[in-house]
Amino acid sequence: TSHLVKCAEKEKTFCVNGGECFMVKDLSNPSRYLCKCQPGFTGARCTENVPMKVQNQEKAEELYQK
């Protein structure tokens, strides 16, 4: 089984644009990294800008769910 742990200090630059880095701990596979992106960014390393229209749609859905 695999689980997520926060990246070590020296691994944090895996993500750009202020994305939060996580490491997928998996005994059977090499370490993988994932990014939790800041609002306005997406992609494997948070490199992609989310168009404003999409951002507003996400906020609306979030409010509706609350």
């Epitope: 020296k10 944090k12 630059t13 895996f14 490199t47 992609e48």
Partner: antibody
């Protein structure tokens, strides 16, 4: 051992095209981030473009946007830089580099000269 | 785009000297700052990333510090093989941007 080998450089006339290749070995190509960086003769380093082979996302410097296209073929472990509408100011050594937490491995570079 | 400014642009030093190069970003880049060494006719080589993390295989005489907008590369005791040009690079956001370089020459 990680290795990056660039090829495809040469002399081209203004307005012409070239395709650079970056052949990679010694690491999981699909799991990395590939960048192209250039260096004009006697000048500093300039970031050009990047691709994440895993999801195909691409990014470009404003100076090359609309003229250059970065791509990757994961079956060949090779990244490409298609350069169109070349200008004299594109003359440089072009390096490809892998990025894990920074640009950790670099190729030897290939020289592109744009001149009539 | 984030502008990176290095100082000095060149310096002369002797073997054994302590050398300090500074790099300033035009806006906050947190700790996302890398340093590269380049020798004539060769590709750049990564020395430091994340402001202070020493790349594997790089001698411990190299060290980096700083966060936010102000960063420093220090060579504690300059060796003959350290005469080269050094570049800083912010890797906080795209486009990735480099400083103009600092050439370390023999006095």
């Amino acid at each position: 051992e990680v290795q990056l080998v660039e090829s495809g450089g040469g002399l081209v006339q203004p307005g012409g095209s070239l395709r650079l290749s970056c052949a990679a070995s010694g690491f999981t190509f699909s799991g990395t981030w590939i960048h192209w960086v250039r260096q004009a003769p006697g000048k500093g380093l300039e970031w050009v473009a990047a691709i994440t082979p895993a999801d195909g996302s691409t990014n470009y410097a404003d100076s090359v946007k609309g003229r250059f296209t970065i791509s990757a073929d994961t079956s060949k472990n090779t990244a490409y830089l298609q350069m169109n509408s070349l200008r004299a100011e594109d003359t440089a050594v072009y390096y490809c580099a892998t990025y894990m937490f920074a640009m950790d491995y670099w190729g030897q570079g290939t020289l592109v000269t744009v001149s009539s | 785009d984030i502008q990176m400014t290095q100082s000095p642009s060149s310096l002369s030093a002797s073997v054994g000297d302590r050398v300090t190069i500074t790099c300033r970003a035009s806006q906050d880049v947190k700790k996302s700052l890398a340093w590269y060494q380049q020798k004539p006719g060769k590709a750049p080589k990564l020395l430091i990333y994340g402001a202070s993390n020493l790349e594997s295989g790089v001698p411990s005489r190299f060290s980096g510090s700083g966060s936010g907008t102000d960063f420093t590369l220090t060579i504690s005791s300059l060796q003959p093989e350290d005469f080269a040009t050094y570049y800083c690079q912010q890797h906080y956001t795209l486009p990735l941007t480099f400083g103009q370089g600092t050439k370390v020459e023999i006095k």
